[in-house]
């Protein structure tokens, strides 16, 4: 079988948030039928890794790939092996991980999301970026921004695309 | 179980070479034993994704994260499921297909490469860049810098950090 | 009512330069992505290249990527397209046109364009 | 880069003849495609968005159906005003790219 990847659409959001390219980010956010203010809580927290320059873009570029691949994930698909090798199919949720990593991007505290990260790249450099880029999303968005972004990521899950 | 990453060296290589950063290149090909041949070759590689800018690094790690995140890499995780969870541990190697996409990289043509990536992420603009930084590579490394690649390659994937 | 002026066309020498303006009016510019399209005699559309409604993001076609540079001036309501490195087969109609919103990037309004010959 | 075909190329019909125009995507675009109309000397205008969404102020006549890889125009009765050439566009993803166009001319 010919395996599907896991959840593109939240890859393609994810690498046009953290490249700081408007129009990418917009075609992606169209694809998920984004709101206006969804719209808007994406762009702050694009302003973040713009903001913080290229080397921002990158290592957390490196967080989300070594999540991604992470035995935690593979996991994940190892849970359902038994169930799923009947069907022969394997399903296309995001990792549980990855969701995880977002979800304290956005709702936990620095530390909380700075140890998340630890997890997976204990890095110095990779930590530092990691909470220059939380305090930068704290900052910039209320929380209603952050409401927006967390309903834009169920819409993202939820989507077909994923 | 807490899962190890896979191979986390390989990524730490990856993301150092495709953001240019030749301090962190250094410092990754350090960890491996790399020969002053086997770096040169990673910087001829590293200068192809400097000359062709941001764009492409953003949209080769997009590459990166996907096949590394696809159902064939979660998949080889579940092949060896049944003798994994007797052990309960779950191997670090790098999964194949993201093994066989830097094969390609490498040794293959052009067509070979960007036809294993469009397995993966099918964007134009994707393929598109997958297309120039090969024909880049090609252009810039000799056999010999090739055989230095993979020579690295080897140590990569045999390395305790992996 | 939205309007959107091209100017700056002309005949260009190949390897020489011009660049492009688009004066818009009517609606709220810093709002909207904007477009170029160009149109050689008596052929169809080529989409060249694109800029977000804040300028810090743009795309291109290949055929000019590295030699076209597209940009955008808020403050004057102006669009520009810098063309280096000109070639024969640039010679054409250019047109500059606002993408209808964010979320579905059609192209509502577009210029009277501006005729760019490239010859020697 | 998404390549579009167009058919016909030409076609020649007369005022109140039902027209249908057919635009193919190299790959599945879902229903990211808009339908422009040119007239000679003038800029295009833009007729239909995300496949069959008409454009505001275009008559009713003027339709548009399919999604994935197969759209079609249709004008269900023809008007002098309707002779023109008429080009599809992808917004699936960058770059944006145009169909061949098909030219409408009076039989």
């Known amino acids: 079988v010919k395996m599907a990847e896991t959840c593109p659409i939240f890859y393609d959001v994810f690498f046009a948030v953290a490249n700081g390219n408007e129009l990418l980010l917009d075609l992606s956010l169209t694809k998920v039928n984004a709101t206006e203010p969804e719209r808007t809580a994406m762009k702050k927290i694009q302003d973040c890794y713009v903001e913080n320059g290229l080397i921002s873009r990158v290592l957390d570029g490196l967080v989300m790939t070594t999540i991604s691949s992470s035995k935690d994930c593979m996991g994940e698909a190892v849970q359902n092996t038994v169930e799923d090798l009947k069907l022969n199919t394997l399903g296309r949720e995001i990792c549980p991980a990855v969701k995880r990593g977002v979800d304290l991007f956005l709702t936990g505290t620095p530390d909380e999301y700075v140890e998340q990260v630890a997890q997976y790249k204990a890095l110095p450099v990779v930590l530092e970026n990691a909470r220059i880029l939380k305090n930068c999303v704290d900052a910039k968005m209320t929380e209603e921004d952050k409401e927006n972004a967390l309903s834009l990521l169920d819409k993202i899950y939820t989507s077909p695309l994923c | 179980v807490k899962m190890a990453e896979t191979c986390p060296i390989f990524y730490d290589v990856f993301f150092a070479v495709a953001n240019g950063n030749e301090l962190l290149l250094d410092l990754s090909l350090t960890k491996v034993n790399a020969t002053e041949p086997e770096r040169t070759a990673m910087k001829k590689i590293q200068d192809c994704y400097v000359e062709n800018g941001l764009i492409s690094r953003v949209l080769d790690g997009l590459v990166m994260t996907t096949i590394s995140s696809s159902k064939d890499c979660m998949g080889e995780a579940v092949q060896n499921t049944v003798e994994d969870l007797k052990l309960n541990t779950l191997g670090r190697e790098i999964c194949p297909a993201v093994k066989r996409g830097v094969d390609l990289f490498l040794t293959g043509t052009p067509d070979e490469y960007v036809e294993q990536v469009a397995q993966y992420k099918a964007l134009p603009v994707v393929l598109e860049n997958a297309r120039i930084l090969k024909n880049c590579v090609d252009a810039k490394m000799t056999e010999e810098d090739k055989e230095n690649a993979l020579s690295l390659l080897d140590k990569i994937y045999t390395s305790p950090l992996c | 009512e939205v309007q959107l002026v091209e100017s700056g066309g002309g005949l260009a020498q190949p390897g020489g330069s011009l660049r492009l303006s688009c004066a818009a009016s009517?609606?709220?510019?810093?709002?909207?992505?904007m477009t170029w399209v160009r149109q050689a005699p008596g052929k169809g559309l080529d989409w060249v290249s694109a800029i977000s409604d804040s300028g810090r993001s743009t795309f291109s076609a290949d055929s000019v990527k590295g030699r076209f540079t597209i940009s955008r001036d808020n403050s004057k309501n102006t669009l520009y397209l810098q063309m280096d490195s000109l070639r024969a087969e640039d010679t054409a109609l250019y047109y500059c046109?606002?993408?209808?919103?964010?979320?579905?990037?059609?192209?509502?309004?577009w210029g009277q364009g501006t005729l760019v010959t490239v010859s020697s | 880069d998404i390549q579009l075909t167009q058919s016909p190329s030409f076609l020649s019909a007369s005022v109140g003849d039902r027209v249908t125009i057919t635009c193919w995507a190299s790959q599945g675009i879902s229903s990211y495609l808009a339908w422009y109309q040119q007239k000679p000397g003038k800029a295009p205008k833009l007729l239909i968005y995300s496949a069959s969404t008409l454009q505001s102020g275009v008559p009713s006549r003027f339709s548009g159906s399919g999604s994935g890889t197969e759209f079609t125009l249709t004008i269900s009765s023809l008007q002098p005003e309707d002779f023109a050439t008429y080009y599809c566009?992808?917004?699936?993803?960058?770059?944006?790219?145009f169909g061949p166009g098909t030219k409408v001319d009076i039989k």
């Open positions: 009517g609606f709220t510019f810093n709002n909207y992505a």
């Open positions: 566009q992808q917004l699936n993803s960058y770059p944006f790219t």
């Open positions: 046109a606002k993408h209808r919103n964010w979320n579905y990037p059609v192209f509502d309004y």
